[in-house]
Amino acid sequence: MRRGPRSLRGRDAPAPTPCVPAECFDLLVRHCVACGLLRTPRPKPAGASSPAPRTALQPQESVGAGAGEAALPLPGLL
């Protein structure tokens, strides 16, 4: 089975500087920033029925996101 996309948040990131859980690694500035400063995928409320934006990001396969994480399981890199 093909593995889904890697992400840039969190726990199992390679060293040297993994982001803490509330931060995301911003490739453009090359350091961790508050995830709220980036357009991170937002989980839908339970029962939400409104259609997703026409080109919002979606993984083709789940890769086992941790509890409470957004639609993409983002482990923070660097």
Partner: antibody, heavy 118, light 111 residues
């Protein structure tokens, strides 16, 4: 749903400054990266630059000396200024925003054609 | 900057046929185990529409007939069976580093 809408003059005279504004709804420009891209008629897409959540900017080196991107957070708008325009700047100008973490531009304005002519 | 070269420039096919589009980067667009290569579809008078991100992941609402593959410098967009609405121009784009760059497109036209 995030929506972007470009606005500005469709005709600019040579040597003048092209000014466009992108109005964003459905998200705050204090989050993410907000970009300008242009497409010459029938040709490739050319990246112009961005303004970030912090207000920092990046300009494509090929246009850097003539480009300014700014923002008005109170109106949730960001703007493009391109100085000393020539006919070669005639293009469709798009504003767009990439999602995280893949920086793929999933939201685009509909584009606005700017013609440089006297 | 990273230069993206797309081939062929034009692909003439019939509905129902398979389309294979190529994008080659002047240097690797891989970073942190991710291929930062995206594919867009553009129809006349419209903005580009994101189809595939990170080389192989379909954006929301994109039909399963669209698939992407590749890593490093060589990437492919495949449309398994062309529908009438798929005739358009397709662009690849790298988001590994700024300036983000685009290929000059492959036009898929009706044969």
């Amino acid at each position: 749903q995030v929506q972007l809408q470009e606005s500005g003059p469709g005709l600019v005279k040579p040597s003048q400054t092209l000014s466009l504004t992108c109005t964003v709804s459905g998200d705050s420009i204090t989050s993410g990266y907000w970009n300008w891209i242009r497409q010459h008629p029938g040709k490739c897409l050319e990246y112009i630059g961005y303004i970030s959540y912090s207000g920092s900017t990046y300009y494509n080196p090929s246009l850097k000396s003539r480009v300014t991107i700014s923002r008005d957070t109170s109106k949730n708008q960001f703007s493009l200024k391109l100085s000393s325009v020539t006919a070669a700047d005639t293009a469709v100008y798009y504003c767009a925003s990439p999602n995280y973490p893949f920086y793929a531009m999933d939201y685009w304005g509909q584009g606005t054609l700017v013609t440089v002519s006297s | 900057e990273i230069v993206l070269t797309q081939s062929p420039a034009t692909l003439s096919l019939s509905p129902g046929e398979r389309a294979t589009l190529s994008c080659r980067a002047s240097e690797s667009v891989d970073n942190y185990g991710i291929s930062f290569l995206n594919w867009f579809q553009q129809k006349p008078g419209q903005a580009p529409r994101l189809l595939i991100y990170a080389a192989s992941n379909r954006a929301t609402g994109i039909p399963a007939r669209f698939s992407g593959s590749g890593s490093g410098t060589d990437f492919t967009l495949t449309i398994s069976s062309l529908e009438p609405e798929d005739f358009a121009v397709y662009y690849c784009q790298q988001s590994k580093e700024v300036p983000w760059t685009f290929g000059c497109g492959t036009k898929v036209e009706i044969k």
